[in-house]
Interface confidence: low
C-alpha cells in the first residue's frame, strides 16, 4: 500500500492549472513517434506564450547501433529504426534570450526561462485531459538545506576543469528543490561480513563507530537531493558469513538479497540493506539492483571495503544505494554536479556530489511510486545514531524534532528547544497526525497501489500509519492469469508496457524460446562468471523479456540497446539497458511472473509456484469474504469483520488498523 500521492503542489505558494495546445499537427493523445520539432501554446499569468521545441538530437544519434555476437563470435550490427525520443530544447517566441528545457514523454515537464521570470511546468497527476501545473520558480517553497560539500570544496574541485563551467552547487540545489520538495528518509541497514570484521581487529565497537561515521557521510551526500539517511540497524557477522560469498559479484548480491528477504526483513524493518565486504571482485567495487529500494526481495547492494578510507568507501556505498534509489550511471549522459566527477559515474571516483541526472532518476522513481517507503519518518527507537535535538530526526528520548530555531517557529506542535511536544499536542508528525492531533481511527493513511495491495488506516492513538502489508504472495490476480508477488500483479503484458509503452504486449512463447536460447546479452537466463547463460526451453519464459506491438522507444534517462528478432510472422522486441556490470538487468522477466500452469519465475528459472509458500484457503480461513495478507492474516471485504471475516463488520484486517470509527466526532462540526 502506498501513501496517497497527492503532494504535487504542497511545495508551491502559487500555481496555475493549464492545458497546453500543440500547434504542429494534432495534440498527441496516444503513443506515436515524437516530432523532431514541435510548438505549443502555453498560458502563464494571463499571457499566452508560443514555445518552439527541437528534439535534442545529441541524445540518440541517427546511426544508433546495436552490436551483438553470435555463437561463432562474429560481430552482428543492428540499426533499430527508432528516432522518436522526447527530450527537447527550445525558446519562447518573441522573448529575447529565452530558453527552454522540456521533456515531452508523458506530458510536458521542465523549465521555461523568460526575460524576467523562470517557470516550471509539469503534468497534473491523474489528469486524462493533458492538464499541467505551471508555476514561477520563485514560488517554490525553499526549505533550508545543508550542503554536503562546502563552497571551498566546490571551488577546489571545479578549478581542476576550467574548460567547462558546471552550475554551482547552490544553483543545482535550487533547481532540484523544484522537483524534490519533499524530504525522503532512507532507513538503511548495514551488514558487515566476517572478513571485514576480522580486518578491524574483531573490534565490534570500532566496526560500529565506523559504520555510523559511514552513515553520516552518506547523509551529508544525500542531503543535496533532500534525502536523509537513517541507519536503522547494523549486523556484524562475527562468527562467519551467513551467505556464500564465493563466485562473482552477481552471485553474492543474489545470495545477499535472498538472505535479507528470508531472515533480515522479519527481524528489522528497513528500506535498503547494504552488505560491506572485504573481498573484492576483480575491479568491481560493488553491485546493486536499480529502483528497488522499497522491494521486499531486491532492496539491497554489496560494497567492497578493502584498503581504502571510509571517506572513499562512502562514495561506493552512496553509488550502490543510489542504484537502489533508481539512479543509473552518469556515463554518456549530459550530467553535471559542480565537480569533475559525480557519485554515479561508473568508475569509483570518490566523488561526493550527485549529478543532475541522478536527481532526475530519483524523481522518476518517486513519480512512478517506486519510493513510497521513503515517505515515513523513522520512529525514534529505529534510528541508530547519536541523538541530537535540532537535527530534524526524532531520536530516542525526543517526541519531535522541528530542526533549527527558525524552522521551529513554523511548527505548531513541537517545542524546538526541548524536542518535546507542546502541552496541547498529541503528535507533531506522521501520516496519522493532523493539526497536532491523532487522526481518528478509520482514516485511510495508505491506499492500495494495485490489485495485489491492501489499504491501511490510522488506529486513532498513534501518529503512524499501520505497517505496510499487501496480499500474500501466490494469490491469483489478473483473472487468474498471474500471481501476486510483493504487492504487484506480475504478468508479461504489464512489464512490456512499462518498457515499450501502453500498446505493447508479450511476444509469443516462440520468441522467448528462440531469443533466450542464444546466451548473449539480448537473450539469456542470467549471468555466471563472465558468461551469459543460455535458457533451457523450460526456462525461456524467465529470461529476457520479449514484447510485440512496440510503438515507443523506452526512455529511462539512459539510451538502451534495442533488438528486434523476426519470429513466425511477428517481431520480438527486447532491450539491453547497458547499465554496467554492477547493475542487474531490468529487461529480464520479473520474478514472480507466471510462466506456466502453477509455475513462476525465480532466479531465471520456471519453478513450481509452491516456492511462494502460498497456504491460504480463503474459503476456510477467511470464510470466502477476504484474502490473506503478507502476514498471513485475513483482510476482509467491506461488510465483514476481521480476524476471520466470519461476522458482519467493516472490512480490513488485524494489521490494517480499524476501517471504521464508532466515536467519529473528531472531524464533524
Amino acid at each position: 500500500a502506498a501513501r496517497p500521492g497527492f503532494q504535487q503542489t504542497s511545495h508551491l505558494s502559487s500555481y496555475e492549472i493549464i492545458t497546453p495546445w500543440r500547434l504542429t499537427r494534432e495534440r498527441r493523445e496516444a503513443p506515436r513517434p515524437y516530432s523532431k520539432q514541435v510548438s505549443y501554446v502555453i498560458q502563464a499569468e494571463g499571457k499566452e506564450h508560443i514555445i518552439h521545441l527541437e528534439r535534442n538530437k545529441d541524445l540518440l544519434p541517427e546511426d544508433f547501433v546495436v552490436y551483438t555476437y553470435n555463437k561463432e563470435g562474429t560481430l552482428i550490427t543492428d540499426h533499430p529504426n527508432i528516432q522518436n525520443h522526447c527530450h527537447y530544447r527550445g525558446y519562447v517566441e518573441g522573448v529575447h534570450n529565452s530558453s527552454i528545457a522540456l521533456s515531452d514523454c508523458f506530458g510536458l515537464r521542465g523549465l521555461l526561462h523568460l526575460e524576467n521570470a523562470s517557470y516550471g511546468i509539469e503534468p497534473l497527476q491523474n489528469s486524462s485531459h493533458f492538464e499541467h501545473i505551471i508555476y514561477r520558480m520563485d514560488d517554490v517553497y525553499k526549505e533550508p538545506l545543508k550542503c554536503g560539500v562546502s563552497n571551498k570544496d566546490i571551488e577546489k574541485e571545479t578549478a581542476k576543469d576550467e574548460e567547462e563551467e558546471p552550475p554551482s552547487m547552490t544553483q543545482l540545489l535550487r533547481r532540484r528543490r523544484a522537483v524534490l520538495p519533499q524530504t525522503r528518509y532512507v532507513e538503511l541497514f548495514i551488514v558487515v561480513d566476517k572478513e571485514r570484521y576480522d580486518m578491524m581487529g574483531r573490534n565490534q565497537t570500532a566496526v560500529r563507530e565506523e559504520m555510523i561515521l559511514l552513515a553520516n557521510y552518506l547523509d551529508s551526500m544525500y542531503i543535496m537531493l533532500n534525502i536523509r539517511i537513517v541507519l536503522v540497524g547494523l549486523e556484524i557477522w562475527t562468527n562467519g558469513n551467513l551467505i556464500n560469498i564465493v563466485g562473482g559479484a552477481g552471485d553474492v548480491l543474489g545470495n545477499f538479497v535472498q538472505w535479507r528477504e528470508k531472515f533480515l526483513i522479519t527481524r528489522r524493518r528497513h528500506d535498503s540493506a547494504q552488505l560491506v565486504l572485504k573481498k573484492g571482485f576483480g575491479g568491481t567495487a560493488g553491485m546493486a539492483f536499480v529502483g528497488t529500494v522499497c522491494s521486499r526481495s531486491h532492496a539491497g547492494g554489496i560494497n567492497v571495503f578493502g584498503q581504502i578510507t571510509v571517506e572513499t568507501f562512502a562514495s561506493i556505498v552512496a553509488h550502490e544505494l543510489g542504484h537502489n534509489l533508481g539512479m543509473n550511471h552518469d556515463d554518456g549522459r549530459d550530467c553535471s554536479c559542480g565537480a569533475k566527477s559525480c557519485i554515479m559515474n561508473s568508475g569509483a571516483s570518490g566523488s561526493r556530489n550527485f549529478s543532475s541526472c541522478s536527481a532526475e532518476d530519483f524523481e522518476k522513481l518517486t513519480l512512478n511510486k517506486g519510493g513510497n517507503c521513503l515517505l515515513n519518518i523513522p520512529k525514534p527507537d529505529e534510528a541508530y545514531s547519536a541523538p541530537s535535538c535540532g537535527n530534524k530526526l526524532v531520536d530516542a528520548g525526543e517526541e519531535c524534532d522541528c530542526g533549527t530555531p527558525k524552522e521551529c517557529e513554523l511548527d505548531p506542535c513541537c517545542e524546538g528547544s526541548t524536542c518535546k511536544l507542546k502541552s496541547f499536542a498529541e503528535c507533531a508528525y506522521g501520516d496519522c497526525c493532523k493539526d497536532c492531533r491523532f487522526l481518528p481511527g478509520g482514516t485511510l493513511c495508505r491506499g492500495k497501489t494495485s490489485e495485489c495491495d491492501v489499504p491501511e488506516y490510522c488506529n486513532g492513538s498513534s501518529q503512524f500509519c499501520q505497517p505496510d502489508v499487501f496480499i500474500q504472495n501466490g494469490y491469483p490476480c489478473q483473472n487468474n492469469k498471474a500471481y501476486c508477488y510483493n504487492g504487484m500483479c506480475q504478468y508479461y503484458d504489464a512489464q512490456c508496457q512499462v518498457i515499450f509503452g501502453s500498446k505493447a504486449k508479450a511476444a509469443p512463447k516462440d520468441c522467448f524460446i528462440e531469443v533466450n536460447s542464444k546466451g548473449d546479452r539480448f537473450g539469456n537466463c542470467g549471468f555466471s562468471g563472465n558468461e551469459y547463460k543460455k535458457c533451457a526451453t523450460g526456462n525461456a519464459l524467465c529470461g529476457k523479456l520479449q514484447c510485440e506491438n512496440v510503438q515507443e522507444i523506452p526512455v529511462f534517462g539512459i539510451v538502451p540497446a534495442i533488438i528486434q528478432t523476426p519470429s513466425r510472422g511477428t517481431k520480438c522486441w527486447g532491450v539491453d539497458f547497458q547499465l554496467g556490470s554492477d547493475v542487474p538487468d531490468p529487461g529480464m522477466v520479473n520474478e514472480g511472473t507466471k510462466c506456466g500452469a502453477g509455475k513462476i519465475c525465480r532466479n531465471f528459472q520456471c519453478v513450481d509456484a509452491s516456492v511462494l509458500n502460498y497456504d491460504c484457503d480463503v474459503q476456510k480461513k477467511c470464510h470466502g469474504h477476504g484474502v490473506c495478507n503478507s502476514n498471513k492474516n485475513c483482510h476482509c471485504e467491506n461488510g465483514w469483520a476481521p480476524p476471520n471475516c466470519e461476522t458482519k463488520g467493516y472490512g480490513g484486517s488485524v494489521d490494517s488498523g480499524p476501517t471504521y470509527n464508532e466515536m467519529n466526532t473528531a472531524l464533524r462540526d
Partner: nanobody, 125 residues
Framework: EVQLVESGGGLVQAGGSLRLSCTGS????????MGWFRQAPGKEREFVAY????????NYADSVKGRFTISRDNAKNTAYLQMNSLKPEDTAVYHC??????????????????WGQGTQVTVSS
C-alpha cells in the same frame, strides 16, 4: 461502512444553478477520493467530476468543464458539486462515489468502492 447520502437535487430552469452535497456517515472521509457520476434514463452512467482526498486536484468531464465545480470539506465529511449554467441535457440522477484507490482512475466507475443512492436533477427548457 461508508454510507454516502446525496442532497440538493431538484427542478431548475435552463441557465439556473444547483448545489449538490454528498455526506459520508459512520466513517471518516479523509483519504477517500470522491467522484460524481450521473445517469440519464436509458443511458449509461457517465463520469462528471472528481476531487482528490485532500482537495488539491479536481477533474471534469468535457461536457461540464467551466460550468460545474467540485469541492470538499473534510471537516464536515462532505463533498459538493456546484452546477451553474445548467442545460436540459444535464438532467439525470446524480450519484456521488468514494474510492481509496491511490491511482484514482477518476473516470472509471468500477474503481469506486462506495456509492450513494442518487439525487434527481431535472433541467427544464
Amino acid at each position: 461502512e461508508v454510507q454516502l447520502v446525496e442532497s440538493g437535487g431538484g427542478l431548475v430552469q435552463a441557465g439556473g444553478s444547483l448545489r449538490l452535497s454528498c455526506t459520508g456517515s459512520d466513517r471518516t472521509f479523509i483519504g477517500y477520493h470522491m467522484g460524481w457520476f450521473r445517469q440519464a434514463p436509458g443511458k449509461e452512467r457517465e463520469f462528471v467530476a472528481y476531487i482528490s482526498s485532500g482537495g488539491a486536484y479536481s477533474n471534469y468531464a468535457d461536457s461540464v468543464k467551466g460550468r460545474f465545480t467540485i469541492s470538499r470539506d473534510n471537516a464536515k465529511n462532505t463533498a459538493y458539486l456546484q452546477m451553474n449554467s445548467l442545460k436540459p441535457e444535464d438532467t439525470a440522477v446524480y450519484h456521488c462515489a468514494a474510492t481509496d484507490y491511490n491511482k484514482a482512475y477518476a473516470r472509471e466507475g468500477r474503481r469506486y468502492d462506495y456509492w450513494g443512492q442518487g439525487t434527481q436533477v431535472t433541467v427544464s427548457s
